[in-house]
């Protein structure tokens, strides 16, 4: 059974889609810079037709490795699922590699595709950059998230994203746009931007479809 | 369980400054994030800024710029350092504390301790 709650704006996206946030939690952005970006990502799903049916969310922080918070099977009220990307704890770590997270991305989050109706994205939320020697594999994950029809797009967030990355994921496919923002500050005012880019690549859901109407039989 | 008492209100004129403090007890201060809240007469309860536990701050747009807020984790204080008050900044000011990582920094649910608000009046 579906756990809907009435939507809390006018633009709701109602659209079949796999929705995984993926928060860089390095030292380039600051305990309150963090604050930012985890309000962005709630007031994002407050504008989701969160349901296992409509939009499901995953949320993932990223240091050194992958901190999965909400899974997309979760079955769980928008609301406890928005209380719970609000309690995103802060790692302050020095590194946050993308290169790692789009390897859990790919073979964790999307390891099965069980909606291959669904649209898949990534929404790649990135302060920083990792070192060369964790970048290696990087376009290899990329092109493997291609491969299973997951857009990636990444938000680059203050003058250290790596845009050497954010180009390469470009590249990768013309779905993948970059959002590239000077500091967090622009989130909010790039908020309805992303989420209806990300909604429009997101198919509706078909008409529902009517049983035919069963034949009368006269004895 | 923290205990927080706000202190510093007073009425001055437009242009002059005002600091206010937040002192905590019952807890460890440094693994709290603090904010300041403000309410005027007739209005709802506003968000004014933010401190993380790491010294990093954001405010609200009608203060940035204005108000600076500090932390002193060795005291256990919070401060609001107001500056060029303006007429419109009259309200009753408020500390929040909420551990660091649950919620969302603007939002005066998710703060379960407060001080008990301290009355700040600017005239023209």
């Known amino acids: 059974e579906d756990i809907s709650e009435p939507p809390l704006h006018d633009f709701y996206c109602s659209r079949l889609l796999d929705l995984v946030f993926l928060l860089d939690g390095s030292s380039r952005l600051s305990e309150a810079e963090f604050e930012v970006l985890k309000a962005f990502v709630v007031d994002m799903m407050e504008r989701l037709r969160i349901s296992q049916k409509w939009v499901r969310v995953a949320v993932v922080e990223y240091h050194d490795g992958s901190h999965a918070y909400i899974g997309l099977k979760d079955r769980k009220r928008p609301s406890e699922l928005r209380r719970i990307a609000s309690q995103v704890k802060y790692a302050g770590s020095q590194v946050a590699s993308t290169s790692e997270v789009l390897k859990y991305t790919l073979f964790q989050i999307f390891s099965k595709i069980d909606r291959p109706e669904a649209s898949r994205i990534a929404l790649l939320l990135m302060a920083s950059q990792e070192p060369q020697r964790m970048s290696r594999n990087f376009v290899r994950y990329v092109q493997g998230l291609k491969k299973k029809k997951v857009i990636v797009i990444p938000v680059g967030i203050g003058p250290h994203a790596n845009l050497k990355q954010i180009r390469l994921i470009e590249k990768q496919a013309p779905e993948n746009k970059a959002f590239v923002l000077s500091s967090v500050d622009e989130l909010e005012q790039q908020r309805d931007e992303i989420v209806s880019y990300l909604c429009d690549l997101a198919p509706e859901a078909p008409p529902p479809t009517l049983p035919p109407h069963m034949a009368q039989v006269t004895v | 369980q923290v205990q927080l008492q706000d202190s510093g209100g007073g009425s001055v004129q437009a242009g002059a400054s005002l600091r206010l403090s937040c002192a905590a007890s019952?807890?460890?201060?440094?693994?709290?994030?603090m904010a300041w809240f403000r309410q005027a007469p007739g209005k709802e309860r506003e968000f004014v800024g933010f401190i993380g536990s790491d010294g990093s701050t954001l405010y609200s747009s009608s203060v940035r710029g204005r108000f600076t807020i500090s932390r002193d984790n060795a005291k256990n204080t919070v401060a609001l350092q107001m500056m060029n008050l303006k007429p419109e900044d009259t309200a009753v000011y408020y500390c929040?504390?909420?551990?660091?990582?649950?919620?969302?920094?603007?939002?005066?649910?998710?703060?379960?301790?407060w001080g008990q608000g301290t009355q700040v009046t600017v005239s023209s």
């Open positions: 929040a504390a909420r551990a660091r990582y649950s919620g969302i920094y603007y939002r005066e649910t998710d703060y379960p301790y």
């Open positions: 019952g807890g460890t201060f440094s693994s709290y994030a």
